[in-house]
């Protein structure tokens, strides 16, 4: 355990005057594990002026860090870095005088309490005054700074002229783009201090660059992917009091593919399963032996799950006979193309025959097969069908 | 060397006030905290409170609480202990305490008799 | 604020092992300080952070402290160890002393 601190298996305090600490508590070396550790409580120690950018990163299960009624005057910048899981910091009665939010706009803090620290009266802190207003909580904090008469003004009362809130505009065409294509984005952003102009782009894959001047930017998407549909493209503003940003989605528009289609499988149903790509959404097409399959109330497609424009389903057939032994082919189509893939399914052989004896399937019509097409999605009439067992889609997501 | 020396003995009435008071040598006076203990005839150890001579930040515990003050001069890297009125059950000796390991560095003691 | 259980007192032959315990709610999550006053003196810190010894002071003290209980040992006690030992804690900001234990050595 660091010198005059305490420790268990996942929290760290030194609250002692004296001794006391000089420096922020390190674990030595085959000691506890630094990862589990979850909280680290400073208090009384007035020697302890600064957290280093290499301090707090070993404790990557930080979630509450407590430095109270002590000497703490600086924290570097990229101090928290490495610390995703801090919930809750507590800065009370401490000697800052500034404080950036950069150690903390990376972080998803619940609570971050700075009372009685002497910040100094200056657009470095406007951010805090921000923070406050965003909250409105009843609990907001009484935070005092100290102007060039060495005067104390609230906080809330702050007025510093050319420090505001930047903002951002993003002038987007149609953000809906066929795939392989290319598309170009333009923002600019606004605001005193100047802000900081950066894109996130979040997990893009398609291959992408950008140009950015002081406010205004741009960014160059080449040979779209069809993966990025639905993607978040962001334009940041970002300087010393805060963030803006502006957002659009990027639909692409691609031909179907069956990235999946398997032999029957038996559950409540038999069930052809598949799985099929494709944005607009693709009207499917199932063919029997090559001819239509129009789908009934025994033998239908079934959606389970959707995933943008992924669709997860079966072809769900009731109580199948050696009748329905078959070739089944699914055609997938829309306006920028089509895909399609076959299997042969064998549910059963024939009557008094061993089961798998006879290679040829029937040559059978259905009855009551038409020619109607299916769009993704149950369409079977169900007003007069019996309550059925299969696994629809019950997300209440649109097939 | 690291040392604390306490101002004499004082003799006093109860209702009287008093400060008496701790200098500091050998060290950086406003780097650590000082502490004041009481002990009364025959009895053992009690904290008072402690002082941080760079900022003032006085502690005290919850028995004298409104009952002393602490207070320091980092100028001449002296602490003090004060009441604006003495009682005779404040009769005790009374010790500073310091140094940057811990506590270890005590100064003599004040002796403070409060009798009518 | 918590308090601190020390015996009264204790007696030791010369040479024996001197353990004076101190005890309080989870004590064992605090520093324990350990203090020596003889008579008309001022007292004299033997321990500290629970095991640390200051500079000057023999080898023969050494402390411990778990659970609810803090112990100073004196290993081949010595008739000038003869003095009132004081355990000592932080509650929160604020010192708190054990009531004393007068060692005595026969």
């Known amino acids: 355990c660091p010198t005059s601190c305490k420790c268990s298996a996942s929290r760290i305090w030194c609250s002692d005057p004296s001794p006391g600490i000089v420096a922020f508590p390190r674990l030595e070396p085959n000691s506890v594990d630094p990862e589990n550790i979850t909280e680290i409580f400073i208090a009384n120690q007035k020697r302890l002026e600064i957290i280093n950018e290499d301090d707090v990163e070993a404790y990557v299960g930080l979630r509450n860090l407590t430095i109270v009624d002590s000497g703490l005057k600086f924290v570097a910048h990229k101090a928290f870095l490495k610390n995703s899981n801090l919930q809750h910091i507590n800065f009370t009665r401490n000697k800052l005088t500034s404080l950036s939010r950069k150690h903390f706009r990376h972080l998803d803090l619940s609570e971050l309490i700075l009372v009685g620290n002497p910040f100094t009266c200056s657009c470095d802190i406007m951010w805090i005054k921000t923070l406050q207003e965003a909250k409105s909580s009843p609990d907001t904090q009484d935070l005092y700074c100290l102007n060039e008469s060495s005067k104390n003004i609230p906080l809330a009362n702050l007025q510093i002229p050319n420090c505001g809130l930047p903002s951002a505009n993003l002038a987007a065409p149609n953000l809906t783009v066929e795939e392989g294509k290319s598309i170009t984005l333009s923002c600019s952003v606004a605001g005193d201090p100047v802000p900081n102009m950066y894109w996130d782009v979040g997990n893009l894959v398609s291959k992408h660059m950008n140009e950015t001047s002081h406010t205004q930017g741009s960014l160059r998407i080449t040979n779209i992917s069809s993966d990025d549909s639905g993607k978040q493209i962001s334009c940041v503003a970002e300087n010393l009091v805060g963030e803006d940003q502006d957002s659009v989605n990027l639909t692409v528009h691609f031909a179907p593919t069956i990235t999946f289609l398997e032999s029957p499988t038996s559950d409540h149903h038999w069930c052809i399963p598949f799985t099929v790509k494709g944005n607009p959404k693709p009207a499917l097409q199932w063919f029997y032996n090559g001819a239509i399959l129009n789908e009934s109330k025994y033998i239908c497609t079934k959606i389970h799950v959707t995933n943008h424009t992924e669709y997860h389903g079966c072809l769900q057939l009731d109580n199948p006979t050696h009748m329905n032994n078959g070739d089944y082919t699914l055609i997938a189509k829309n306006e920028y193309g089509k895909d399609e893939k076959q299997i042969s399914a064998h549910f059963m052989g024939w009557p008094g025959i061993d089961d798998g004896a006879n290679p040829n399937y029937p040559d059978v019509i259905y009855e009551d097969y038409g020619t109607a097409a299916n769009d993704i999605g149950d369409t079977t009439n169900r007003s007069n069908e019996i309550p059925s067992t299969d696994v629809t889609d019950k997300t209440g997501r649109e097939h | 060397q690291v040392q604390l020396l306490q101002s004499a003995a004082e003799v006093k009435k109860p209702g009287e006030s008093l400060k008496i008071s701790c200098k500091g040598s050998g060290y950086r006076f406003t780097s650590y905290w000082i502490g004041w203990v009481r002990q009364m005839p025959g009895k053992g150890l009690e904290w008072v409170g402690i002082i941080y001579p760079d900022d003032s930040d006085t502690r005290y515990s919850p028995s004298f609480q409104g009952q002393v003050t602490i207070s320091a001069d980092t100028s001449i890297s002296t602490t003090y202990l004060q009441w604006s009125s003495l009682k005779a059950s404040d009769t005790a000796i009374y010790y500073c305490?310091?140094?940057?390991?811990?506590?270890?560095?005590w100064g003599q003691g004040t002796t403070v008799t409060v009798s009518s | 604020q918590s308090v601190l259980t020390q015996p009264p007192s204790l007696s030791v032959s010369p040479r024996q092992t001197a353990s004076i315990t101190c005890s309080g709610d989870k004590l064992g999550d605090k520093f324990v300080s350990w203090y020596q006053q003889k008579p008309g003196q001022s007292p004299v810190l033997v321990i500290y952070?629970?095991?640390k010894r200051p500079s000057g002071i023999p080898e023969r003290f050494s402390g411990s402290n778990s659970g609810n209980t803090a112990t100073l040992t004196i290993s081949g006690t010595q008739a000038m160890d003869e003095a009132d030992y004081y355990c000592?804690?932080?509650?929160?900001?604020?010192?708190?002393f054990g009531g004393g234990t007068k060692l005595t050595v026969l």
């Open positions: 000592q804690a932080w509650d929160s900001s604020t010192g708190v």
């Open positions: 305490a310091s140094g940057e390991v811990a506590f270890d560095v």
């Open positions: 952070q629970d095991t």
